[in-house]
Amino acid sequence: KIDTPQRGSIQDINHRVWVLQDQTLIAVPRKDRMSPVTIALISCRHVETLEKDRGNPIYLGLNGLNLCLMCAKVGDQPTLQLKEKDIMDLYNQPEPVKSFLFYHSQSGRNSTFESVAFPGWFIAVSSEGGCPLILTQELGKANTTDFGLTMLF
């Protein structure tokens, strides 16, 4: 088992990258002098206790920033949030911390990230640029749920 996070960069099919702005992740077109975030990801060590064939359950964080992506309900709506959290603290817990877990599925070069806590809800960006990352259950034209994940070695 790999027990250190892997690092990666993410962009969507419109070549927008993830940028941290006021503790919020937004997707913007790549430009010079821009600093896209580097993703830290690590597979859940309790994979056998999670659903099979849904993807690889992973914790997703921002490399070097002690921030992790999580899903929580605001009212009745699952929302995507950034929480101050060491990704290895999550990895080492005695049970999967589902609010911080995502099923990572790959099809060709495309990756999707489905919330483990809220099945059927995916990390997405609006088709319009400069918008925060969200969770959506509508896999259509309004939102992009397919991302390109490039691992950095």
Epitope: E48, Q93, E95, P96, A117
Partner: antibody
Framework: QVQLVQSGAEVKKPGASVKVSCKAS????????IHWVRQAPGQGLEWIGR????????RYDPKFQGRATITTDTSTSTVYLEFSSLRSEDTAVYYC??????????????WGQGTLVTVSS | QAVVTQEPSLTVSPGGTVTLTCRSS?????????ANWVQQKPGQAFAGLIG???DRAPGVPARFSGSLLGGKAALTISGAQPEDEADYFC?????????FGGGTKLTVL
């Protein structure tokens, strides 16, 4: 408020099976893990196993693997422990407990009132 | 499989400080054992006190604190109250299962 309410006391003969229930209220059972623990007379606590009610996956102490079966009915927010091939040494109070993630860690925060299972010929 | 051992009984004076410990037969207890402490008062259900070695559960008074002490998990009650008279159990995590201790009966006298 959060509550775990267990079924009533049972008397069983050696070799029989028993099924104990634990009904949850005041929280969404799918957001936590439900564990079963037992306490024999004058003894400490003994962990039996747990279930993830959202998915149905289980873990068991190797000692109880094969004799204990934990299931859930999310429509009624109820978790069950079935214990088979009972012997006199299985006489104990059986407890369900919620293992809940809060802040930075998991806590065995809420427990059922216990179900006494007596195994006697 | 590890055996987890606690002091069978301890006594503390009201307002005094007492430390309960939790030892593992498999070696030193570490933060990777995610020590939990639960309390059972006479005639009441169990209630969680500590998780993750030193995190207090919501609503637990600050006089309860968890730590590691000499290779053991420890629960310290500072300024013990009469209502702290109870049985206390620790639980340690070992890779894929939990092991509970035999419990400590605490008398506040």
């Amino acid at each position: 408020q959060v509550q775990l309410v267990q079924s009533g006391a049972e008397v069983k003969k050696p070799g029989a099976s028993v099924k104990v229930s634990c009904k949850a209220s005041g929280f969404n059972i799918k957001d936590t893990y439900i564990h079963w623990v037992r306490q024999a007379p004058g003894q400490g606590l003994e962990w039996i196993g747990r279930i993830d009610p959202a998915i149905g996956t289980t873990r068991y102490d190797p000692k109880f693997q094969g004799r204990a079966t934990i299931t859930t009915d999310t429509s009624t927010s109820t978790v069950y422990l079935e214990f088979s091939s009972l012997r006199s040494e299985d006489t104990a109070v059986y407890y369900c407990a919620r293992l809940h993630y809060f802040g930075n860690n998991f806590f065995f925060d809420y427990w059922g009132q216990g179900t006494l299972v007596t195994v006697s010929s | 499989q590890a055996v987890v051992t606690q002091e069978p009984s301890l006594t503390v004076s009201p307002g005094g400080t007492v430390t309960l410990t939790c030892r593992s037969s498999s070696g030193a207890v570490t933060t990777s054992n995610y020590a939990n402490w639960v309390q059972q008062k006479p005639g009441q259900a169990f209630a969680g006190l500590i998780g993750g070695t030193n995190d207090r559960a919501p609503g637990v008074p600050a006089r309860f604190s968890g730590s590691l002490l000499g290779g053991k998990a420890a629960l310290t009650i500072s300024g013990a109250q009469p209502e702290d008279e109870a049985d206390y159990f620790c639980a340690l995590w070992f890779s894929n299962h939990w092991v509970f201790g035999g419990g400590t009966k605490l008398t506040v006298l």
